[in-house]
Amino acid sequence: DAGVIQSPRHEVTEMGQEVTLRCKPISGHNSLFWYRQTMMRGLELLIYFNNNVPIDDSGMPEDRFSAKMPNASFSTLKIQPSEPRDSAVYFCASSL
């Protein structure tokens, strides 16, 4: 069984451009989480969904960030406009 699948693996963009990250959770998992990790700030929970419904998006108070989960097998995290300080590793995770 495949694990959580994210794309793209790497993204380089100019400041001000829109960035869209995609995630496919493990089949049968009903919770999905987006995290951000940097050296300076550590691991931050951005948002999590349960049964496709956003439960807590308090980790992304800037309205440049938006996340959607249109169905049980797909989620996106969008940054518009992007800023240099958004440079980080973004993780998607899922759980039962």
Partner: antibody, heavy 117, light 106 residues
């Protein structure tokens, strides 16, 4: 009914410290981001700090970094603002506010901080 | 940091008037948010995501705009609308407010 009640304000000397509290009720505090905002006498609103539900995301106004520390205790439904090295210009009414509708949808009544010798 | 400039800073108007307050951002923002504050009271959210009315806010209030310029309009002023109004942005931290617009009775 959403309620936010600030406390801990008072008169403090320059260089002193104060810890403000904000007791929350009527909503799921442990899933909600919270802000501190202040208003100096006769002046406009100034955003101070933000903390996410689990405290992993914390933001400050640039001018206050290093002196002010935001924190929360979800088991007590309480938000805090620790203020150190206080200056006369920190004199203000301090409000806590709930993050909602992408903004600040509920506010407390405020607590007054006066920094004076 | 972004700067929000409201105009006018002071506005005298009469009951029944239509008034518009403008909020200009030094850098483009995704949305504007508007608050009303009366003397000695906490601010109250009026408009979120540029044009959405907060619960309980009368329909005479409306918001519009995009990019660097946003407006709050009151279609027919009522006595209880005389207050100070603030815009705010959440596109990028720090979450600055405009300096405020004081709406007074003419």
């Amino acid at each position: 009914e959403v309620q936010l009640v600030e406390s801990g304000g008072g008169l403090v000397q320059p260089g002193g410290s104060l810890r403000l509290s904000c007791a929350a009720s009527g909503f799921t505090f442990s899933r909600t981001g919270m802000h501190w905002v202040r208003q100096a006498p006769g002046k406009g609103l100034e955003w101070v700090s933000y903390i996410s539900s689990g405290s992993s995301t914390i933001l400050y106004a640039d001018t206050l970094k290093g002196r002010f520390t935001i924190s929360r205790d979800n088991s007590k439904n309480t938000l805090y603002l620790q203020m150190n090295s206080l200056r006369a210009e920190d004199t203000a009414v301090y409000y806590c506010a709930r993050r909602g509708e992408g903004a600040m949808d509920y506010w407390g009544q405020g607590t007054t901080v006066t920094v004076s010798s | 940091d972004n700067q929000l400039t409201q105009s006018p800073s002071f506005l005298s108007a009469s009951v029944g008037d239509r008034v518009t307050i403008t909020c200009r951002a030094s850098k483009s923002v995704n949305y504007a948010y508007w608050y009303q504050q009366k003397p000695g009271k906490a601010p109250k959210l009026l408009i979120y995501y540029t044009s959405n009315l907060a619960p309980g806010v009368p329909s005479r209030f409306s918001g519009s705009g995009s990019g660097n310029e946003y407006t709050l309009t009151i279609s027919s002023l009522q006595p209880e609308d005389f207050a100070t109004y603030y815009c705010q942005q959440f596109t990028s931290s720090p979450f600055v407010f405009g300096q405020g617009t004081k709406l007074e009775i003419k």
